[in-house]
Protein backbone atom coordinates (compact mmCIF):
# COMPACT_ATOMS: atom_id res chain seq x y z
CA UNK A 1 0.00 0.00 0.00
CA UNK A 2 1.52 3.49 -1.01
CA UNK A 3 1.89 5.93 2.05
CA UNK A 4 -0.32 8.81 2.00
CA UNK A 5 1.89 12.16 1.14
CA UNK A 6 0.94 15.42 2.16
CA UNK A 7 -0.63 17.24 -1.17
CA UNK A 8 0.55 21.16 -1.34
CA UNK A 9 -0.91 23.79 -3.37
CA UNK A 10 2.68 24.24 -4.92
CA UNK A 11 4.28 22.38 -7.81
CA UNK A 12 7.19 20.01 -6.02
CA UNK A 13 11.09 20.29 -5.73
CA UNK A 14 13.03 20.87 -9.36
CA UNK A 15 13.41 17.88 -11.10
CA UNK A 16 17.22 16.65 -10.67
CA UNK A 17 17.46 19.04 -7.60
CA UNK A 18 20.74 18.00 -5.67
CA UNK A 19 22.97 17.05 -8.94
CA UNK A 20 21.19 21.11 -10.35
CA UNK A 21 22.48 22.66 -6.74
CA UNK A 22 25.79 20.94 -7.50
CA UNK A 23 26.68 21.27 -10.46
CA UNK A 24 25.83 25.48 -10.14
CA UNK A 25 28.41 25.42 -6.73
CA UNK A 26 31.13 23.55 -9.51
CA UNK A 27 30.45 25.88 -12.35
CA UNK A 28 30.44 29.64 -9.72
CA UNK A 29 33.29 28.58 -8.08
CA UNK A 30 35.27 27.66 -10.92
CA UNK A 31 34.13 31.14 -12.04
CA UNK A 32 34.53 33.30 -9.62
CA UNK A 33 38.22 32.63 -8.35
CA UNK A 34 37.73 34.49 -4.57
CA UNK A 35 35.17 31.44 -4.09
CA UNK A 36 37.49 28.30 -5.56
CA UNK A 37 38.28 27.37 -1.64
CA UNK A 38 34.58 26.15 -1.21
CA UNK A 39 33.83 22.81 -1.03
CA UNK A 40 30.71 22.25 -2.84
CA UNK A 41 29.76 18.39 -1.48
CA UNK A 42 30.00 20.48 1.51
CA UNK A 43 27.48 22.88 0.10
CA UNK A 44 24.76 20.37 -0.74
CA UNK A 45 25.16 18.81 2.61
CA UNK A 46 24.23 21.76 4.17
CA UNK A 47 21.51 22.41 1.65
CA UNK A 48 20.07 19.33 1.88
CA UNK A 49 20.35 19.48 5.70
CA UNK A 50 17.87 22.60 6.05
CA UNK A 51 14.77 21.31 4.90
CA UNK A 52 15.36 17.02 4.78
CA UNK A 53 13.14 15.38 6.98
CA UNK A 54 12.17 18.44 8.62
CA UNK A 55 8.00 19.90 8.52
CA UNK A 56 8.15 21.80 5.27
CA UNK A 57 5.66 24.83 7.06
CA UNK A 58 8.24 24.27 10.36
CA UNK A 59 11.55 25.64 8.37
CA UNK A 60 13.34 28.26 10.56
CA UNK A 61 16.65 30.59 9.38
CA UNK A 62 18.68 28.75 11.91
CA UNK A 63 18.09 25.75 9.60
CA UNK A 64 19.86 27.29 6.77
CA UNK A 65 22.77 28.47 9.53
CA UNK A 66 25.20 26.04 8.34
CA UNK A 67 24.89 26.81 4.38
CA UNK A 68 24.97 30.64 5.49
CA UNK A 69 28.09 30.14 6.83
CA UNK A 70 29.66 27.98 3.99
CA UNK A 71 28.40 30.60 1.42
CA UNK A 72 29.82 33.19 3.26
CA UNK A 73 31.02 35.80 0.17
CA UNK A 74 32.20 39.24 0.39
CA UNK A 75 30.98 41.29 -2.68
CA UNK A 76 31.66 44.91 -2.60
CA UNK A 77 28.96 46.84 -0.25
CA UNK A 78 28.80 49.81 -2.82
CA UNK A 79 27.78 48.00 -5.73
CA UNK A 80 24.34 46.06 -4.64
CA UNK A 81 21.61 46.04 -6.99
CA UNK A 82 18.50 45.09 -5.34
CA UNK A 83 15.25 44.77 -7.69
CA UNK A 84 11.58 43.65 -7.44
CA UNK A 85 9.68 42.41 -10.09
CA UNK A 86 12.03 42.67 -12.88
CA UNK A 87 14.56 40.01 -12.04
CA UNK A 88 15.23 39.51 -15.78
CA UNK A 89 16.54 43.16 -16.26
CA UNK A 90 18.38 43.54 -13.47
CA UNK A 91 20.33 40.05 -14.29
CA UNK A 92 21.10 41.30 -17.86
CA UNK A 93 22.10 44.60 -16.51
CA UNK A 94 24.60 43.19 -14.10
CA UNK A 95 26.08 40.86 -17.17
CA UNK A 96 27.03 44.27 -19.09
CA UNK A 97 28.03 46.53 -15.78
CA UNK A 98 30.15 43.19 -14.30
CA UNK A 99 31.09 45.37 -10.97
CA UNK A 100 27.35 45.41 -9.60
CA UNK A 101 26.02 42.44 -8.13
CA UNK A 102 22.35 41.13 -7.78
CA UNK A 103 21.65 38.41 -5.10
CA UNK A 104 21.53 35.98 -7.99
CA UNK A 105 25.02 36.79 -8.45
CA UNK A 106 26.05 35.73 -5.33
CA UNK A 107 27.04 31.86 -4.60
CA UNK A 108 23.83 31.58 -2.52
CA UNK A 109 21.09 33.32 -4.66
CA UNK A 110 22.95 31.88 -8.24
CA UNK A 111 22.35 28.12 -6.57
CA UNK A 112 18.66 28.35 -5.61
CA UNK A 113 17.35 31.03 -8.14
CA UNK A 114 14.34 29.44 -9.78
CA UNK A 115 14.84 26.45 -8.06
CA UNK A 116 12.03 25.05 -6.14
CA UNK A 117 12.67 22.52 -2.84
CA UNK A 118 11.02 20.82 -0.07
CA UNK A 119 11.09 17.23 1.81
CA UNK A 120 8.94 15.42 4.01
CA UNK A 121 9.06 15.15 8.31
CA UNK A 122 10.81 12.14 9.46
CA UNK A 123 12.07 10.71 6.25
CA UNK A 124 14.84 11.36 3.91
CA UNK A 125 12.87 12.22 0.51
CA UNK A 126 13.11 15.17 -1.11
CA UNK A 127 9.27 15.62 -2.46
CA UNK A 128 8.96 16.15 -6.00
CA UNK A 129 5.25 16.02 -6.03
CA UNK A 130 4.05 19.33 -3.94
CA UNK A 131 5.67 21.96 -1.85
CA UNK A 132 3.97 24.41 0.27
CA UNK A 133 2.84 27.31 -1.70
CA UNK A 134 3.58 30.98 0.47
CA UNK A 135 -0.14 31.77 0.03
CA UNK A 136 -2.39 28.86 0.44
CA UNK A 137 -0.32 26.38 2.44
CA UNK A 138 2.43 28.05 4.77
CA UNK A 139 4.95 30.75 4.51
CA UNK A 140 7.92 29.06 6.74
CA UNK A 141 8.41 26.72 3.66
CA UNK A 142 11.78 26.09 2.72
CA UNK A 143 12.01 27.94 -0.39
CA UNK A 144 10.45 31.02 1.31
CA UNK A 145 12.67 30.62 4.27
CA UNK A 146 15.55 30.55 2.34
CA UNK A 147 15.11 33.68 0.32
CA UNK A 148 14.09 35.69 3.10
CA UNK A 149 17.48 34.72 4.56
CA UNK A 150 19.85 35.31 2.11
CA UNK A 151 18.43 38.77 1.39
CA UNK A 152 18.00 40.00 4.36
CA UNK A 153 21.70 39.24 4.61
CA UNK A 154 22.50 40.65 1.30
CA UNK A 155 20.61 44.18 2.37
CA UNK A 156 22.49 44.12 5.68
CA UNK A 157 25.78 43.88 3.70
CA UNK A 158 25.18 47.04 1.84
CA UNK A 159 26.43 50.56 2.06
CA UNK A 160 27.35 53.77 0.58
CA UNK A 161 24.50 54.39 -2.64
CA UNK A 162 22.45 50.95 -2.90
CA UNK A 163 20.17 51.28 -6.13
CA UNK A 164 16.84 48.87 -6.74
CA UNK A 165 15.53 48.45 -10.37
CA UNK A 166 11.33 48.76 -9.92
CA UNK A 167 8.62 46.98 -12.41
CA UNK A 168 7.15 50.76 -13.63
CA UNK A 169 4.54 48.01 -15.63
CA UNK A 170 2.66 46.89 -12.63
CA UNK A 171 0.10 48.23 -10.51
CA UNK A 172 2.10 48.47 -7.60
CA UNK A 173 5.55 49.48 -8.83
CA UNK A 174 6.98 49.27 -5.17
CA UNK A 175 4.95 46.42 -3.37
CA UNK A 176 5.38 46.07 0.52
CA UNK A 177 4.81 42.41 0.30
CA UNK A 178 7.30 41.73 -2.12
CA UNK A 179 11.04 40.13 -0.74
CA UNK A 180 12.37 43.31 -1.55
CA UNK A 181 9.52 45.53 0.59
CA UNK A 182 8.99 43.08 3.59
CA UNK A 183 12.82 42.26 3.97
CA UNK A 184 15.60 44.20 2.04
CA UNK A 185 14.26 47.27 2.77
CA UNK A 186 13.79 46.86 6.38
CA UNK A 187 17.48 45.35 6.71
CA UNK A 188 19.32 48.39 5.07
CA UNK A 189 21.82 49.68 7.93
CA UNK A 190 21.59 53.42 8.14
CA UNK A 191 24.69 53.54 9.52
CA UNK A 192 26.18 52.12 6.48
CA UNK A 193 23.86 53.16 3.69
CA UNK A 194 23.20 57.01 2.51
CA UNK A 195 20.98 56.61 -0.17
CA UNK A 196 18.68 54.27 -1.61
CA UNK A 197 18.06 55.19 -5.84
CA UNK A 198 15.36 53.18 -7.00
CA UNK A 199 15.30 52.55 -10.89
CA UNK A 200 11.59 52.62 -11.84
CA UNK A 201 11.59 50.65 -15.01
CA UNK A 202 8.90 51.89 -17.54
CA UNK A 203 7.42 49.26 -20.00
CA UNK A 204 5.17 50.92 -23.35
CA UNK A 205 7.57 52.93 -25.79
CA UNK A 206 5.27 55.91 -25.63
CA UNK A 207 5.06 56.01 -21.78
CA UNK A 208 6.81 59.82 -20.52
CA UNK A 209 4.86 59.59 -17.10
CA UNK A 210 7.03 60.42 -14.17
CA UNK A 211 6.61 56.79 -12.11
CA UNK A 212 8.88 58.46 -9.45
CA UNK A 213 5.63 60.05 -8.68
CA UNK A 214 3.79 57.09 -7.64
CA UNK A 215 1.88 56.55 -4.58
CA UNK A 216 3.84 53.61 -4.15
CA UNK A 217 7.00 55.32 -4.58
CA UNK A 218 6.21 57.95 -1.93
CA UNK A 219 5.39 54.96 -0.35
CA UNK A 220 8.85 53.54 -0.33
CA UNK A 221 10.46 57.23 -0.18
CA UNK A 222 8.16 57.13 3.25
CA UNK A 223 9.84 53.97 4.67
CA UNK A 224 13.29 54.90 3.53
CA UNK A 225 13.16 58.06 5.05
CA UNK A 226 12.06 57.28 8.38
CA UNK A 227 14.90 54.99 8.33
CA UNK A 228 16.96 57.96 8.05
CA UNK A 229 18.01 56.60 4.71
CA UNK A 230 18.25 59.31 2.13
CA UNK A 231 15.98 58.11 -1.71
CA UNK A 232 16.16 59.13 -5.18
CA UNK A 233 14.37 57.95 -7.89
CA UNK A 234 14.76 58.05 -11.58
CA UNK A 235 12.82 56.96 -14.16
CA UNK A 236 14.11 54.53 -17.29
CA UNK A 237 12.13 55.35 -19.99
CA UNK A 238 13.80 53.23 -22.44
CA UNK A 239 15.10 50.00 -20.87
CA UNK A 240 16.47 48.61 -24.05
CA UNK A 241 18.64 52.16 -24.59
CA UNK A 242 19.31 52.13 -21.33
CA UNK A 243 21.18 48.15 -21.48
CA UNK A 244 22.67 49.60 -24.99
CA UNK A 245 24.53 52.10 -23.33
CA UNK A 246 25.34 50.47 -20.13
CA UNK A 247 26.98 48.51 -22.58
CA UNK A 248 28.44 51.85 -24.86
CA UNK A 249 28.10 54.92 -22.91
CA UNK A 250 30.39 56.74 -25.48
CA UNK A 251 27.72 56.48 -27.64
CA UNK A 252 26.25 59.58 -28.63
CA UNK A 253 23.15 58.86 -28.28
CA UNK A 254 23.30 58.17 -23.84
CA UNK A 255 23.67 61.98 -23.34
CA UNK A 256 20.07 62.19 -23.64
CA UNK A 257 17.42 60.75 -21.00
CA UNK A 258 16.54 57.25 -21.26
CA UNK B 1 -10.29 52.47 18.62
CA UNK B 2 -6.78 52.09 21.10
CA UNK B 3 -6.74 51.26 24.58
CA UNK B 4 -3.62 51.40 26.77
CA UNK B 5 -3.19 49.39 29.77
CA UNK B 6 -0.59 48.45 32.35
CA UNK B 7 0.23 52.30 33.81
CA UNK B 8 1.13 51.85 37.64
CA UNK B 9 2.70 53.78 40.20
CA UNK B 10 6.10 52.02 40.80
CA UNK B 11 9.46 52.97 42.58
CA UNK B 12 12.51 54.34 40.47
CA UNK B 13 14.58 51.74 39.18
CA UNK B 14 11.56 49.52 37.96
CA UNK B 15 10.40 47.83 35.32
CA UNK B 16 7.10 48.29 33.43
CA UNK B 17 5.21 47.05 30.51
CA UNK B 18 2.14 48.70 28.88
CA UNK B 19 0.48 47.37 26.00
CA UNK B 20 -1.43 48.75 23.68
CA UNK B 21 -4.95 47.10 21.73
CA UNK B 22 -6.47 47.53 18.86
CA UNK B 23 -9.98 47.17 18.58
CA UNK B 24 -12.25 47.66 14.58
CA UNK B 25 -8.57 47.14 13.27
CA UNK B 26 -5.26 45.09 13.08
CA UNK B 27 -1.88 45.24 12.03
CA UNK B 28 -2.69 42.49 8.61
CA UNK B 29 -2.57 46.40 7.37
CA UNK B 30 1.09 48.02 7.64
CA UNK B 31 0.72 51.14 10.07
CA UNK B 32 3.15 52.41 11.95
CA UNK B 33 1.95 52.27 15.96
CA UNK B 34 3.79 54.75 17.62
CA UNK B 35 3.93 55.49 21.73
CA UNK B 36 3.53 59.08 22.79
CA UNK B 37 4.15 60.42 26.61
CA UNK B 38 3.15 63.60 28.05
CA UNK B 39 4.88 64.19 31.86
CA UNK B 40 1.88 66.34 33.81
CA UNK B 41 1.81 69.85 32.42
CA UNK B 42 4.11 69.61 29.49
CA UNK B 43 4.08 68.88 25.67
CA UNK B 44 4.49 65.19 23.77
CA UNK B 45 7.11 63.57 23.82
CA UNK B 46 7.73 60.88 20.88
CA UNK B 47 9.14 57.40 22.13
CA UNK B 48 9.09 55.46 19.03
CA UNK B 49 7.48 53.47 16.64
CA UNK B 50 7.15 50.09 15.32
CA UNK B 51 6.12 49.35 11.84
CA UNK B 52 3.61 46.35 11.98
CA UNK B 53 4.53 44.72 8.02
CA UNK B 54 7.97 44.24 9.88
CA UNK B 55 9.29 43.26 12.58
CA UNK B 56 13.09 44.67 11.53
CA UNK B 57 11.50 48.23 11.63
CA UNK B 58 11.52 49.43 14.86
CA UNK B 59 12.49 53.25 15.51
CA UNK B 60 13.14 55.04 18.80
CA UNK B 61 14.15 58.72 19.92
CA UNK B 62 17.69 59.46 20.49
CA UNK B 63 16.94 59.45 24.18
CA UNK B 64 15.11 55.98 24.25
CA UNK B 65 16.95 53.75 22.85
CA UNK B 66 18.14 51.05 25.56
CA UNK B 67 15.44 51.80 28.26
CA UNK B 68 12.69 51.17 26.36
CA UNK B 69 11.62 48.62 23.65
CA UNK B 70 8.32 48.77 21.83
CA UNK B 71 7.13 45.15 20.11
CA UNK B 72 4.64 43.61 18.46
CA UNK B 73 2.89 40.72 20.32
CA UNK B 74 -0.11 39.94 18.48
CA UNK B 75 -1.94 40.96 15.22
CA UNK B 76 -3.66 43.77 17.70
CA UNK B 77 -1.22 44.45 20.18
CA UNK B 78 1.47 46.13 20.63
CA UNK B 79 3.73 46.67 23.92
CA UNK B 80 6.33 49.09 25.45
CA UNK B 81 8.76 47.81 27.87
CA UNK B 82 10.08 50.31 30.24
CA UNK B 83 12.99 49.55 32.49
CA UNK B 84 15.20 51.46 35.05
CA UNK B 85 12.18 54.11 35.82
CA UNK B 86 12.89 57.35 37.41
CA UNK B 87 11.12 59.96 38.43
CA UNK B 88 11.17 61.82 35.05
CA UNK B 89 9.21 58.95 33.18
CA UNK B 90 6.14 60.10 35.47
CA UNK B 91 3.99 60.81 32.33
CA UNK B 92 1.11 59.55 30.57
CA UNK B 93 1.69 57.36 27.83
CA UNK B 94 -0.24 57.57 24.44
CA UNK B 95 -0.38 54.29 21.88
CA UNK B 96 -1.27 56.54 18.49
CA UNK B 97 -1.61 54.79 15.05
CA UNK B 98 0.21 56.64 12.25
CA UNK B 99 -2.21 55.75 9.12
CA UNK B 100 -1.96 55.26 5.99
CA UNK B 101 -2.80 58.05 3.39
CA UNK B 102 -3.57 57.53 0.10
CA UNK B 103 -5.42 54.90 -1.83
CA UNK B 104 -4.70 51.14 -0.99
CA UNK B 105 -3.24 51.81 2.65
CA UNK B 106 0.37 53.20 1.04
CA UNK B 107 1.96 54.56 3.44
CA UNK B 108 2.85 58.13 3.06
CA UNK B 109 2.53 59.89 5.99
CA UNK B 110 -0.96 60.50 6.52
CA UNK B 111 -0.44 61.56 10.64
CA UNK B 112 -1.73 59.84 14.00
CA UNK B 113 -4.86 59.28 13.36
CA UNK B 114 -5.95 57.25 16.29
CA UNK B 115 -4.97 57.93 19.47
CA UNK B 116 -5.81 55.77 22.86
CA UNK B 117 -7.24 57.77 26.01
CA UNK B 118 -3.63 56.99 27.95
CA UNK B 119 -2.36 55.30 30.78
CA UNK B 120 -0.51 56.80 33.73
CA UNK B 121 2.92 55.73 34.86
CA UNK B 122 3.72 57.46 38.05
CA UNK B 123 7.52 57.22 39.53
CA UNK B 124 8.18 57.77 43.09
CA UNK B 125 10.28 57.43 46.15
CA UNK C 1 18.65 65.65 14.24
CA UNK C 2 15.17 66.50 12.91
CA UNK C 3 14.38 69.18 15.15
CA UNK C 4 11.13 71.08 15.52
CA UNK C 5 10.50 74.37 17.13
CA UNK C 6 7.43 75.53 17.33
CA UNK C 7 6.47 79.80 17.80
CA UNK C 8 4.98 81.01 20.28
CA UNK C 9 5.02 79.06 22.90
CA UNK C 10 1.84 81.05 23.65
CA UNK C 11 -0.66 83.12 22.00
CA UNK C 12 -4.50 85.03 22.85
CA UNK C 13 -6.65 85.87 20.07
CA UNK C 14 -10.24 87.33 19.84
CA UNK C 15 -13.27 85.54 19.04
CA UNK C 16 -13.88 85.30 15.44
CA UNK C 17 -9.86 86.29 15.02
CA UNK C 18 -6.81 84.65 13.15
CA UNK C 19 -4.17 83.12 14.63
CA UNK C 20 -0.78 81.40 12.98
CA UNK C 21 1.25 79.18 14.24
CA UNK C 22 4.57 78.74 12.98
CA UNK C 23 6.70 75.27 12.70
CA UNK C 24 10.39 75.16 11.90
CA UNK C 25 12.50 71.64 11.04
CA UNK C 26 15.99 71.63 11.42
CA UNK C 27 15.99 70.07 7.97
CA UNK C 28 13.84 69.66 5.34
CA UNK C 29 10.77 67.07 5.82
CA UNK C 30 9.12 66.81 2.81
CA UNK C 31 5.95 68.71 3.74
CA UNK C 32 5.38 65.46 6.31
CA UNK C 33 3.84 67.53 9.12
CA UNK C 34 1.29 67.11 10.54
CA UNK C 35 -0.83 69.44 13.00
CA UNK C 36 -2.97 68.12 16.37
CA UNK C 37 -5.32 69.70 18.77
CA UNK C 38 -4.91 68.86 21.85
CA UNK C 39 -7.32 70.14 25.34
CA UNK C 40 -6.81 69.36 29.06
CA UNK C 41 -8.03 65.46 29.91
CA UNK C 42 -8.17 63.76 26.29
CA UNK C 43 -5.75 62.49 23.97
CA UNK C 44 -4.25 64.75 20.42
CA UNK C 45 -6.86 64.88 17.60
CA UNK C 46 -5.04 64.79 14.29
CA UNK C 47 -6.34 68.18 12.44
CA UNK C 48 -4.43 68.08 9.43
CA UNK C 49 -1.52 66.05 7.49
CA UNK C 50 0.85 65.99 4.64
CA UNK C 51 1.52 69.80 5.98
CA UNK C 52 -1.74 71.10 4.18
CA UNK C 53 -4.84 68.01 4.11
CA UNK C 54 -7.14 67.94 6.38
CA UNK C 55 -7.52 65.03 8.21
CA UNK C 56 -11.32 64.00 8.11
CA UNK C 57 -14.62 65.58 7.53
CA UNK C 58 -15.22 66.40 10.95
CA UNK C 59 -12.35 69.09 10.84
CA UNK C 60 -13.43 72.42 10.09
CA UNK C 61 -11.98 74.22 7.30
CA UNK C 62 -11.22 77.20 9.37
CA UNK C 63 -7.92 75.23 10.26
CA UNK C 64 -5.21 75.96 7.54
CA UNK C 65 -2.21 74.37 6.75
CA UNK C 66 0.74 75.54 4.39
CA UNK C 67 4.24 75.53 3.96
CA UNK C 68 7.29 73.37 2.65
CA UNK C 69 11.26 72.27 2.94
CA UNK C 70 11.42 73.54 6.80
CA UNK C 71 8.98 76.37 7.14
CA UNK C 72 5.48 75.14 8.46
CA UNK C 73 1.94 77.18 9.41
CA UNK C 74 -1.10 76.36 10.94
CA UNK C 75 -3.79 79.03 10.59
CA UNK C 76 -7.24 78.84 12.35
CA UNK C 77 -9.51 81.72 11.50
CA UNK C 78 -12.50 82.71 12.63
CA UNK C 79 -11.32 81.47 16.05
CA UNK C 80 -14.17 79.71 18.32
CA UNK C 81 -14.30 79.15 22.10
CA UNK C 82 -14.05 75.55 20.71
CA UNK C 83 -10.55 76.62 19.49
CA UNK C 84 -9.02 77.44 22.93
CA UNK C 85 -6.40 74.22 22.95
CA UNK C 86 -2.76 73.11 23.01
CA UNK C 87 -1.50 72.89 19.07
CA UNK C 88 1.50 70.60 18.08
CA UNK C 89 3.12 69.97 14.74
CA UNK C 90 4.94 66.80 14.01
CA UNK C 91 7.25 65.96 11.11
CA UNK C 92 6.99 62.35 9.58
CA UNK C 93 9.80 61.86 7.46
CA UNK C 94 12.05 60.88 9.23
CA UNK C 95 12.21 58.40 12.46
CA UNK C 96 16.06 58.10 12.81
CA UNK C 97 18.08 60.59 14.75
CA UNK C 98 15.20 62.38 16.52
CA UNK C 99 14.95 63.24 19.73
CA UNK C 100 11.46 64.76 19.54
CA UNK C 101 9.08 64.53 16.24
CA UNK C 102 6.85 67.15 17.97
CA UNK C 103 6.97 70.73 18.25
CA UNK C 104 7.18 72.39 22.10
CA UNK C 105 3.39 72.91 21.02
CA UNK C 106 1.19 76.32 21.04
CA UNK C 107 -1.56 77.35 24.32
CA UNK C 108 -4.39 78.99 21.89
CA UNK C 109 -6.03 81.73 24.95
CA UNK C 110 -9.65 82.53 23.22
CA UNK C 111 -10.65 86.02 24.72
Known amino acids: VPRWRQQWSGPGTTKRFPETVLARCVKYTEIHPEMRHVDCQSVWDAFKGAFISKHPCNITEEDYQPLMKLGTQTVPCNKILLWSRIKDLAHQFTQVQRDMFTLEDTLLGYLADDLTWCGEFNTSKINYQSCPDWRKDCSNNPVSVFWKTVSRRFAEAACDVVHVMLNGSRSKIFDKNSTFGSVEVHNLQPEKVQTLEAWVIHGGREDSRDLCQDPTIKELESIISKRNIQFSCKNIYRPDKFLQCVKNPEDSSCTSEI | SLEESGGDLVKPGASLTLTCTAS?????????MCWVRQAPGKGLEWIGCIYTGSSDSIYYASWAKGRFTISKTSSTTVTLQMSSLTAADTATYFC???????????????????WGPGTLVTVFS | AYDMTQTPASVEVAVGGTVSIKCQASQTINSWLSWYQQKPGQPPKLLIYQASKLAASGVSSRFKGSGSGTEYTLTISGVECADAATYYCQQGYSFGNVDNAFGGGTEVVVK
Open chain 2, 24 to 32: GFDFTTYYY
Open chain 2, 96 to 114: ARDRPSGNDDYIYDGGMDL
